[in-house]
C-alpha cells in the first residue's frame, strides 16, 4: 500500500522500532529475551519477560515458581497466571491456622460445636467456626451450619442449632490455645482446632510454634514450625519450597526449616531463564563456552554477578537459547540464583513474633 510508505518510513533508522504491516503502524521492538504483551507494542512497558509454565513474573521481574496446591488439604483458589502466583486455600471444611505466601502452611478442620451449642458463624477457608449457647427450648439439630446463622441482634436467637456430633480424632490436631488437655480427654483421642481468635493472652501453646527443645511455659525458646515442604522466610512467613520435579532439574540444596530447596539444571544443561531458587528454563549445554562467566562470591550475598571472560578466552561461537537470551552460567550444573525472597507477600501471621538477627536468619522474638 503506497499510502503506508510515510508511516513505514518513520520506523527506518530507528532500531528500536519496526513496521507491522498487519496493523499498519510502527511498533516498539522488544529487547532480546522480552516478549510483547500486545500485538504492536508502543513502549518498553509493553514488553515483558516470558516465564515457563507454572512460573509467574513477580514484581521484581523475576520468574518465580507458582506454589502448588498438591497437599490433600489444599485446593486452588486462583490459577497460576503470567504475573501472579497460583493461590491455594484450605479445602472446604477446613480453615487456615498458619498462613503461607499464596497458600496455607497448616489447615485444620473446622471445630464441631460442642453438644448443645450452635453455630454463630460457620467456618470458612480462613476462619474457624464460632459457637455459642443455644436458645432455650431449641433442640440442637439443624441440617447445616448455614441454617444456624444468627440474626444480627436480639435477646436470644431463635435459630435452629447445628449438629452436635463430637469432634473425632480426625477433626484437628492441636490443643485449644486457652489451656491444657486433660489426660482423660487425650486418652479418648478427642482433639480440637486452635480456636482462639487472638494471639494475645497468657503463655500457651501456639499451633504455629514447635519447641526447638522442650519449651518451658513463658520462655522464648520456641521457633515457628512450618509444614513439610515449607520454610520460614526472613519475614517470618511459612513459604512453600520450590519443587525440582521437572525432568531438567535436580535438587541442589534440600528444603530446610529456614531456607528453600534450591534447584539447578541437571548435568549437561545450563540455565537460560533464572527463577527464584530454581531455573525456569534449562537448555542443553553448548559445545562452546558462553559469553559470560560467573564471578564466584559468598553465598550469603543475594545476587550472582557477571563479568566478561578474561582476554583471549572469547568463544568462537555465540550460542543462544531459542528466545535469544544468553545462557546464565558456564557451569553445566550451575544455575543463577537470584534473591531468595519473592517480592509478593502476604501479611505475616501473628501467631509467632519473629525478628531478624544480624545474620538475616529469623529468630523468635521472646518479647
Amino acid at each position: 500500500f503506497p499510502q503506508d510508505r510515510p508511516f513505514e518510513d518513520t520506523c527506518h533508522g530507528n532500531p528500536s522500532h519496526y513496521y507491522d504491516k498487519a496493523v499498519r503502524r510502527c511498533c516498539y521492538r522488544c529487547p532480546m529475551g522480552l516478549f510483547p504483551t500486545q500485538q504492536c507494542p508502543q513502549r518498553p512497558t509493553d514488553c515483558r519477560k516470558q516465564c515457563e509454565p507454572d512460573y509467574y513474573l513477580d514484581e521484581a521481574d523475576r520468574c518465580t515458581a507458582c506454589v502448588t496446591c498438591s497437599r490433600d488439604d489444599l485446593v486452588e483458589k486462583t490459577p497460576c497466571a503470567w504475573n501472579s502466583s497460583r493461590v491455594c486455600e484450605c479445602r472446604p471444611g477446613m480453615f487456615c491456622s498458619t498462613s503461607a505466601v499464596n497458600s496455607c502452611a497448616r489447615c485444620f478442620f473446622h471445630s464441631v460445636c460442642p453438644a448443645g451449642m450452635i453455630v454463630k458463624f460457620p467456618g470458612t477457608a480462613q476462619k474457624n467456626t464460632v459457637c455459642e449457647p443455644a436458645s432455650p427450648g431449641v433442640s440442637p439439630a439443624c441440617a447445616s451450619p448455614e441454617n444456624c446463622k444468627e440474626p444480627s441482634s436480639g435477646t436470644i436467637p431463635q435459630a435452629k442449632p447445628t449438629p452436635v456430633s463430637p469432634a473425632t480424632s480426625s477433626a484437628s490436631t492441636m490443643p485449644v490455645r486457652g489451656g491444657t488437655r486433660l489426660a482423660q480427654e487425650a486418652a479418648s483421642k478427642l482433639t480440637r482446632a486452635p480456636d482462639s481468635p487472638s494471639s494475645v493472652g497468657r503463655p500457651s501453646s501456639d499451633p504455629g510454634l514447635s519447641p526447638t527443645q522442650p519449651c518451658p511455659e513463658g520462655s522464648g525458646d520456641c521457633r515457628k514450625q512450618c509444614e513439610p515442604d515449607y520454610y520460614l522466610d526472613e519475614a517470618g512467613r511459612c513459604t512453600a519450597c520450590v519443587s525440582c520435579s521437572r525432568d531438567d532439574l535436580v535438587e541442589k540444596t534440600p528444603c530446610a526449616w529456614n531456607s528453600s530447596r534450591t534447584c539447578e539444571c541437571r548435568p549437561g544443561m545450563i540455565c537460560a531463564t533464572s527463577a527464584t531458587n530454581s531455573c525456569a528454563r534449562c537448555v542443553p549445554y553448548p559445545i562452546c563456552a558462553a559469553e559470560t562467566v560467573t564471578k564466584p562470591q559468598d553465598m550469603a550475598e543475594k545476587d550472582t554477578t557477571f563479568e566478561a571472560p578474561p582476554l583471549g578466552t572469547q568463544p568462537d561461537c555465540n550460542p543462544t537459547p531459542e528466545n535469544g537470551e544468553a545462557p546464565a552460567s558456564t557451569s553445566p550444573t550451575q544455575s543463577l540464583l537470584v534473591d531468595s525472597q519473592a517480592s509478593k507477600t502476604l501479611p505475616i501471621p501473628t501467631s509467632a513474633p519473629v525478628a531478624l538477627s544480624s545474620t538475616g536468619k529469623p529468630v523468635l522474638d521472646a518479647g
Partner: antibody, heavy 121, light 107 residues
Framework: EVTLKVSGPGISQPSQTLSLTCSFS??????????VSWIRQPSGKGLEWLAH???????RYNPSLKSRLTISKDTSSNQVFLKITSVDTADTATYYC?????????????WGQGTTLTVSS | DIVMTQSPKFMSTSVGDRVSVTCKAS??????VAWYQQKPGQSPKALIY???YRYSGVPDRFTGSGSGTDLTLTIINIQSEDLAEYFC?????????FGVGTKLELK
C-alpha cells in the same frame, strides 16, 4: 497484657438510668470471634450474666433484664458500654466486664476488676 | 433458665487435703461448663472449661469432670492459696448461668 477496667457512677437513685463503661487493652473487639460480656454480683451472692456483645456487633441479653439493658461498643477506643434503665435497689451489685476469647467454648478468660454500684434513695 | 445448684456452700479443709465441689444442672448442659476461682476483693479467674479442660497456667491439682447434669471440680493437695470461692458456669443455653458458689475455708 490483657486488662479490663470497669467505671461507673458508684451511686445511683432508683428509677435513674445507669451507664457503665468497660475499657480494655491487649486485644481488639474487631478480632474475629472476640466478645465481651457484662456480669454482676450482688454482695455475698452469686454471679449473674447480663449481656454479651460480639466482634460483629451481634448482641445477646439475659431475657429477665432485656427490656432494661443496652449493650454497645466503640471498637476504635476499646470500650464496651452497658446502659441500665429504671434502676432499683435490686441492681445494687459489683459489675464486671469479661472477655470471651474462645471460638468454641463460652467462658471468660479475663475479667475486669469490677465497680460497685449502690442504688439508694 | 438453667439453674446450677452448687454444693456445698461452705467447706472447711486443711492444707494437703482433697476436696470436691459439685454442680447439678436443672437440665442437660452436656460438657458446656466452666469453673472459676474468686478470692475476696478480686475478680473471678478461669480454672476449667468444657467441663474438663484446664485453663492455661492452672495447676494440675485442679481437675474437672462430669457431663450432662452432674459436674464436679476436684482439688487435690490443697494449698493455702487455694482458699477462695469457686463458681460453676453453664454455657450450654442462653442465658448463661452460674452456681451460687462454694467457699473453701481453713479448718
Amino acid at each position: 497484657e490483657v486488662t479490663l477496667k470497669v467505671s461507673g457512677p458508684g451511686i445511683s437513685q432508683p428509677s435513674q438510668t445507669l451507664s457503665l463503661t468497660c475499657s480494655f487493652s491487649g486485644f481488639s473487639l474487631s478480632t474475629y470471634g472476640m466478645g465481651v460480656s457484662w456480669i454482676r454480683q450482688p454482695s455475698g451472692k452469686g454471679l449473674e450474666w447480663l449481656a454479651h456483645i460480639y466482634w460483629d456487633d451481634d448482641k445477646r441479653y439475659n431475657p429477665s433484664l432485656k427490656s432494661r439493658l443496652t449493650i454497645s461498643k466503640d471498637t476504635s477506643s476499646n470500650q464496651v458500654f452497658l446502659k441500665i434503665t429504671s434502676v432499683d435497689t435490686a441492681d445494687t451489685a459489683t459489675y464486671y466486664c469479661a472477655r470471651r476469647a474462645e471460638l468454641r467454648d463460652f467462658y471468660f478468660d479475663y475479667w475486669g476488676q469490677g465497680t460497685t454500684l449502690t442504688v439508694s434513695s | 433458665d438453667i439453674v446450677m445448684t452448687q454444693s456445698p456452700k461452705f467447706m472447711s479443709t486443711s492444707v494437703g487435703d482433697r476436696v470436691s465441689v459439685t454442680c447439678k444442672a436443672s437440665q442437660n448442659v452436656n460438657t458446656n461448663v466452666a469453673w472459676y476461682q474468686q478470692k475476696p476483693g478480686q475478680s473471678p479467674k478461669a480454672l476449667i472449661y468444657s467441663a474438663s479442660y484446664r485453663y492455661s497456667g492452672v495447676p494440675d491439682r485442679f481437675t474437672g469432670s462430669g457431663s450432662g447434669t452432674d459436674l464436679t471440680l476436684t482439688i487435690i493437695n490443697i494449698q493455702s492459696e487455694d482458699l477462695a470461692e469457686y463458681f460453676c458456669q453453664q454455657y450450654n443455653t442462653y442465658p448463661l448461668t452460674f452456681g451460687v458458689g462454694t467457699k473453701l475455708e481453713l479448718k
